[in-house]
Amino acid sequence: IWSAVFLNSLFNQEVQIPLTESYCGPCPKNWICYKNNCYQFFDESKNWYESQASCMSQNASLLKVYSKEDQDLLKLVKSYHWMGLVHIPTNGSWQWEDGSILSPNLLTIIEMQKGDCALYASSFKGYIENCSTPNTYICMQRTV
Amino acid sequence: IWSAVFLNSLFNQEVQIPLTESYCGPCPKNWICYKNNCYQFFDESKNWYESQASCMSQNASLLKVYSKEDQDLLKLVKSYHWMGLVHIPTNGSWQWEDGSILSPNLLTIIEMQKGDCALYASSFKGYIENCSTPNTYICMQRTV
């Protein structure tokens, strides 16, 4: 975050930006920036693998839910979107693309369907779905 | 927007931020920044007037929908929230807090209810509601 005060003094600007205001990012152009994470919702339906590839091509990953507080904007997301959560049948755990295990109390897993991938739904719910089913998806990029 | 390239050269940083990446804002701390507008969703239910006062106290206004393209993140908003749209009974028009008239084709107005205020709902819908009914609300701040 570039403190507005710092930027003001640096460039000796006249414009007064309140102390409580700050810049967010950096993010890819036209992505959503929130609490220094970048998010983008993609309208086109792809299977989980294609969605993952699409995010990777943009130097991002599929959505990872790591904090209800830092990601509370996700509460209000309408519809269902691929996130980066996959089921590991060998040990029965759910893990993120980066290999970390899903922590308890972050997501409610809802098993209506056979499948090893999960769709994000509002209020921190994850719906199990067949990985080859086309769905919209959310990419995420953590800022440095 | 502070170009990442500009910031890099300014501070002679090693970290390579792609040309396509940029900063968003400035916004109040922990607000959502998208296409250089700032948004915040408030959980507590207030009537329209209280919601307006809450936004004003944060140097913002209730949500104004001015562009489906620049505000396409609103497509995916779940639930119903006060926005800054009010009905002017004298001429039958709908106008924003800043006095501008609602442009055609921006919102679908749905009259379920008698009222002079409107709730924003996903996919650019506006539900007419009694202004004294408590609801959650969206504040918005346009960046300079």
């Epitope: 269902y80 029965g92 755990s93 759910w94 295990i101 899903l102 308890p104 109390n105 997501l107 409610t108 897993i109 809802i110 098993e111 209506m112 369907q113 056979k114 509002s122 209020s123 719910k125 719906y127 067949n130 | -």
Partner: antibody
Framework: EVQLVQSGAEVKKPGATVKISCKVS????????MHWVQQAPGKGLEWMGL????????IYAEKFQGRVTITADTSTDTAYMELSSLRSEDTAVYYC????????????????????????WGQGTTVTVSS | SYELTQPLSVSVALGQTARITCGGN??????VHWYQQKPGQAPVLVIY???NRPSGIPERFSGSNSGNTATLTISRAQAGDEADYYC?????????FGGGTKLTVL
């Protein structure tokens, strides 16, 4: 004994709204989603939607989207289905049904919900729409 | 939207085996549930998740699911099995029922 008891038969005029209740007993209301299913005379079953009583989240069938509102009142252990802008084709029996069970300690200590079918049904409520 | 196809009617001789099919594109990748409904009564779940029986449902009821067809099998059919039978799946965030099959026990 697990029971779902629905409100009585209704006769409504076209354009009106009907609200049916489904009072549960014999289990913890918030541990199962509640579904509503329509059955027109001589026809098959049609799923209308569901509610998670824990947080009020709903999912509606596309056919009924915009006309149906499903709610749950945890203070009275009652689910409701409201159908608006009634037309003659809405003449049917409406069932509430329990399904999707909460398992607080699923694999890896995660909170899980499993769908094992709609295992308990209400007795049905007949709604007649006629002018 | 996803479609489930059931035969309108199936007949079986008393004591014989009845098979009711439910067709759907790649249905084997989905969980299939079966319901029995007798005239004037609410439906009853008889099979869940392809092949599991709820408590109280006789062993004569069994289910299978692979490829494009799910099957409900009722062995040693009894007069009391005469009813409408519906299959059900979850697809695209909606529950879908088949059109129903009327089972007649001769």
């Amino acid at each position: 004994e697990v029971q779902l008891v629905q409100s009585g038969a209704e006769v409504k005029k076209p354009g009106a709204t009907v609200k049916i209740s489904c009072k549960v007993s014999g289990y913890t209301f918030t541990d199962y989603y509640m579904h509503w299913v329509q059955q027109a005379p001589g026809k098959g079953l049609e799923w209308m939607g569901l509610v998670d009583p824990e947080d009020g989240e709903t999912i509606y069938a596309e056919k009924f989207q915009g006309r149906v509102t499903i709610t749950a009142d945890t203070s009275t252990d009652t689910a409701y289905m409201e159908l608006s802008s009634l037309r003659s084709e809405d003449t049917a029996v409406y069932y509430c049904a329990r399904g999707i069970a909460r398992y607080p300690n699923g694999p890896g200590g995660l909170l899980y919900y499993y769908y094992y079918g709609m295992d308990v049904w209400g007795q049905g409520t007949t709604v007649t729409v006629s002018s | 939207s996803y479609e489930l196809t059931q035969p309108l009617s199936v007949s079986v001789a008393l004591g014989q085996t009845a098979r009711i099919t439910c067709g759907g594109n790649n249905i084997g990748s989905k969980n299939v549930h079966w319901y029995q409904q007798k005239p004037g009564q609410a439906p009853v779940l008889v099979i869940y998740r392809d092949s599991n029986r709820p408590s109280g449902i006789p062993e004569r009821f069994s289910g299978s699911n692979s490829g494009n067809t799910a099957t409900l099998t009722i062995s040693r059919a009894q007069a009391g099995d005469e009813a409408d039978y519906y299959c059900q799946v979850w697809d695209s965030f909606a529950f879908v029922f088949g059109g129903g099959t009327k089972l007649t026990v001769l």
